[in-house]
Structures are given as structure tokens and as C-alpha cells.
Amino acid sequence: KKVVLGKKGDTVELTCNASQKKNTQFHWKNSNQIKILGIQGLFLTKGPSKLSDRADSRKSLWDQGCFSMIIKNLKIEDSDTYICEVENKKEEVELLVFGLTANSDTHLLEGQSLTLTLESPPGSSPSVKCRSPGGKNIQGGRTISVPQLERQDSGTWTCTVSQDQKTVEFKIDIVVLAFQKASSTVYKKEGEQVEFSFPLAFTLEKLTGSGELWWQAERASSSKSWITFDLKNKEVSVKRVTQDPKLQMGKKLPLHLTLPQALPQYAGSGNLTLALEAKTGKLHQEVNLVVMRATQFQENLTCEVWGPTSPKLTLSLKLENKGATVSKQAKAVWVLNPEAGMWQCLLSDSGQVLLESNIKVVPTW
């Protein structure tokens, strides 16, 4: 007999063909011989089966010798052997209906686990293979678990259920609630305005919650809360902000913070947390601020950076249009008795300039 796999809530067409392409008597019954539907005259009649109100047939195909039964809004319990009686012959079709659902909400925080559960008819032994949007493959039986969701797991998961060499495909949309970036670094010259942006990696119809930015300045012994805010239907309102520095916050998404001036005492690392309404756990994004200062004091030209820099970054002092350069993998460089002219202080990573500051050295007579 033919095996057909269906999905819970879906529609399936069970085909039944007569050898002669003409309109003839036919009936569909279940394994208990209860009539579901059939022809009486030219009318489609329905039997006492619990399926009858969800079963249909296409009259337009009858004169092509096709007497399909279409079942709408499939249920797991519709799994059965169905018998089509046409032209004094019986065609059997085994229908197996499967359901695949996420155990929890499909909007999950980064790091949380996802469990998919397969509903299947008694006596079946299906296998399930799921592929994440990022191409990760996971196999299982009745349940499939993804222990720690990552940002790239957001999107449509495609799961294939296999039984009796037949397959049925499920698509499940998973939204991983996270910031677009885990970490970002802003490089600024002393005195410049600093813009911090925290774009979300998802969109929700209604977005409500509260957040806070904690800051650990490089020069400070402990971290402190710079700002707390509320988010209501994508509108941002500041609850509390420190006096120094006095941060400003945008009223709309993406979350946007402005520090009026980059100063060495602000250089360091911050952690922005966002707790969403009706969700356990918080979203996190780390943000770093690196500040550069170039100064001339008496016969000494100095360039310094503050904040979290990697040891492989190079700090250089270079006289414009001249070969004179001093470079170090350090947080400060200096030149004694510098030549007059425009000096450049450069912070670079493998040749790529991250930050530069110019300082003019005037001749001393």
C-alpha cells in the first residue's frame, strides 16, 4: 500500500485513480470501514466519519478518472489506512500525520536552549533531522535539543521527518533575542563626541523592557552605573543618569548613547544589559572606549592611549612628509626634542589605522 506523510494543521490529497477516464461510483472509507465520502448520483455525499467535515473531493477531476480525497486541517489522529473503492477494486493509502513544535516560545534569548518535540502516530518510528539557518545539522528522534542558541541560529529552521523512506518537511521560525554585535570598540581623540549604538538583531511588534549601562573605567577601581532606561513599545525613556559623564540617550531604537566628550578618565569598558518583558534573562553587549591624547610639553612630544587595547596594536609618532617615526606596541610613545612640523599620532592594527591625532610642533628659538 501507498504511504503518505502529512503535517498537523496542513492539507493532504490522497489520490485514487480509475483505469477509465470517466465519472464513476467511488467511496472513501477508513480502516474501520466507516464511509467518509463518495458519489451518489452526481452529488458528493459524506458519511458518519469524524473526518467528514474536513474531507473533500474535486468534481472537476472525476471525469479524468481521478477520485482524490482531500483532508484539511490534519490531526495526528487522522493517521490511518484509508480505502478507496472504485471500479470494484480497492486502493489502500496509509496516512501518517506528524507535528513538530517548539517546547517553549520561539523567541529565545541568546544562550538559552531550544527543544523541538515531534508528535507522531502510535506505531511509527520516525527520524528527524534539522538544519539551522547557519547550516548546523542536528539529528534526533522524538525530541531535538539545541543547548545554547547563538545569534546565527535566528531564522527558519528546516526539519525533515522521515518514515518508510518518505519525508515531510517542517519550517520553524526561531528568533534569537540578541544585540547585533557581542562587542564593539569606539576609538576617539580626546575631546571628541562619542556615539555608542546598540542595534538589535531582531524586530518585535511590541518591545518593552528596561536596561542599564555599567561602566568600568580603566583608571577606576570599581564599575559604576552610567545610565538606566525603560523601553516601552520601542520608545526609550531615561530613568537615571550619572552627573559625570552626563550621557544622552536617543528616544527611538536602535539604542543610542552620546557621550559629550571623550576624556582619558572615561576610557574603559561598558556592559549594556537589556531585560525584556516576559523573558527570563538579559541581552548583553560589551562596548569599549579607547581615547587618544597627543601633547607637547617642553622638549617632549607624547602620544598616549587609554582604554582596552590589544597588545598587538601599534602606537606611532610620525612627522608628516618625513621619514622620522617612532613606533611601539605600547600605550604611550614619545619623542624628545621633536623637529618642527605636523606630527601624526597613529594607533594601528596590522597596518590599518584605527585612530589618529595631529599635533603641530612649532620651532623653539
Partner: antibody, heavy 115, light 107 residues
Framework: QVQLQQWGAGLLKPSETLSLTCAVY????????WSWIRQSPGKGLEWIGE???????NYNPSLKSRVTISVDTSKDQFSLKLSSVTAADTAVYYC?????????WGQGSLVTVSS | DIQMTQSPSSVSASVGDRVTITCRAS??????LAWYQQKPGNAPKLLIY???SFQSGVPSRFSGSGSGTDFTLTISSLQTEDFATYYC?????????FGQGTKLEIK
């Protein structure tokens, strides 16, 4: 609730090929047949043809020689191609879901054939 | 092809009136008939199928009857939102065919 969204070129020159696509959202793609219907002031509502998930098609004999309906089950989409168009093919084209009745329709695409 | 003929092609009526539209098939189609309502700029909307069954969400003032070749759509008490064009469609055999439409206008 199933939604059908359709798109395609709106202005064609005679002898060109009309091409429209319809995407099915939020409902079962399998088990149903997916139709194209057009509506013009002169001919009223005219059924063009249909396809199912397996690619089985039925066409209106009056248009059969010029019509191709195809399906992309990976995207839950189906498409219409009508070749050698003339001014008589100017109409609003609809995609629709059918078993026996057209119970869900696309928003319609106005196709104008003019030199 | 099965020809579907609707009458009248247009009808003027007032809110609260009872209106009947008829549809005749060129050959017997048992009860394989549907009725649709279409408002300007919109796609048709299924009202009645199997000649007399209601599509979900359709108000009970709409009713369908008939079998074989003659069918009727009745609106028992016209409401403002019912002014539209109505079409019948046969699903008995390919190609599916529609009536030419009946435009229901405010008197």
C-alpha cells in the same frame, strides 16, 4: 490565516511574455491547487489554469497553447507565464487557492499590453 | 465549456430590501456552485459554496439555493456594505467558469 502575495511586470508590448509569481504565506501549500484567474472588462472573470504541489497542472483550453504554470515548493510559490501577448490579454490577474472554490485570493496585478 | 448566465446584470435596491440574483448553468452541475462578492479595487470574496453552504464569517442574511442548472443568491435585508458585484462559479468540470456578474447598486 493564508495570504497570497503576487508580483510581476505590469506593462508589456505585444508578442512579449507575461510573467507573474504568487507567494503563499501562513497556510498549507500541500493538498491545495493554486490557480491563476484574470478579469477584464470585456471577458469578466476567466480561469487560466492551476497547479498543485506535485506540479500537476490543468489549463483552460482557450489559453493552453500559450500558458505555463510552474511551482517552487521550497519557497511556497507558483508562477504564470503567458506567451505572445496581445491587447486582448490586458486584465487584472489574480492568483487564488482552490479545491473546488476559490477561497483565498491575491491582491491582483494589473497587466497592460500596449505598443 | 459550461456557460454560466446571471440575471439581472444589474439591480438597484435600498437598505433593508430583499434581493435575489439568479445563475443558470448551460448543463447540470448538481450543487457544484459558488457565489462571490467583489467590491471595486478588491479581489472577489467567497460567500457561498456547494450552492448553499456558508463560508466562515459570512453574515446569515446571505443564502444560496438550487441544484442542477438553476441557482439563486438571496440577501434577506440589504446592508450598506452589500452594494457590490456578485458572481457565480461552477466547479463541476474544467475549465472553471464564472457568470458575467450582477452589479447591486443603491437606489
Amino acid at each position: 490565516q493564508v495570504q497570497l502575495q503576487q508580483w510581476g511586470a505590469g506593462l508589456l508590448k505585444p508578442s512579449e511574455t507575461l510573467s507573474l509569481t504568487c507567494a503563499v504565506y501562513g497556510g498549507s501549500f500541500s493538498g491545495y491547487y493554486w490557480s491563476w484567474i484574470r478579469q477584464s472588462p470585456g471577458k469578466g472573470l476567466e480561469w487560466i489554469g492551476e497547479i498543485n504541489q506535485s506540479g500537476s497542472t490543468n489549463y483552460n483550453p482557450s489559453l493552453k497553447s500559450r500558458v505555463t504554470i510552474s511551482v517552487d515548493t521550497s519557497k511556497d510559490q507558483f508562477s504564470l507565464k503567458l506567451s505572445s501577448v496581445t491587447a486582448a490579454d490586458t486584465a487584472v490577474y489574480y492568483c487564488a487557492r482552490v479545491i473546488n472554490w476559490f477561497d483565498s485570493w491575491g491582491q491582483g496585478s494589473l497587466v497592460t499590453v500596449s505598443s | 465549456d459550461i456557460q454560466m448566465t446571471q440575471s439581472p446584470s444589474s439591480v438597484s435596491a435600498s437598505v433593508g430590501d430583499r434581493v435575489t440574483i439568479t445563475c443558470r448553468a448551460s448543463q447540470g452541475i448538481s450543487s457544484w456552485l459558488a457565489w462571490y462578492q467583489q467590491k471595486p479595487g478588491n479581489a472577489p470574496k467567497l460567500l457561498i459554496y456547494d450552492a448553499s453552504s456558508f463560508q466562515s464569517g459570512v453574515p446569515s442574511r446571505f443564502s444560496g439555493s438550487g441544484s442542477g442548472t438553476d441557482f439563486t443568491l438571496t440577501i434577506s435585508s440589504l446592508q450598506t456594505e452589500d452594494f457590490a458585484t456578485y458572481y457565480c462559479q461552477q466547479a463541476n468540470s474544467f475549465p472553471y467558469t464564472f457568470g458575467q456578474g450582477t452589479k447591486l447598486e443603491i437606489k
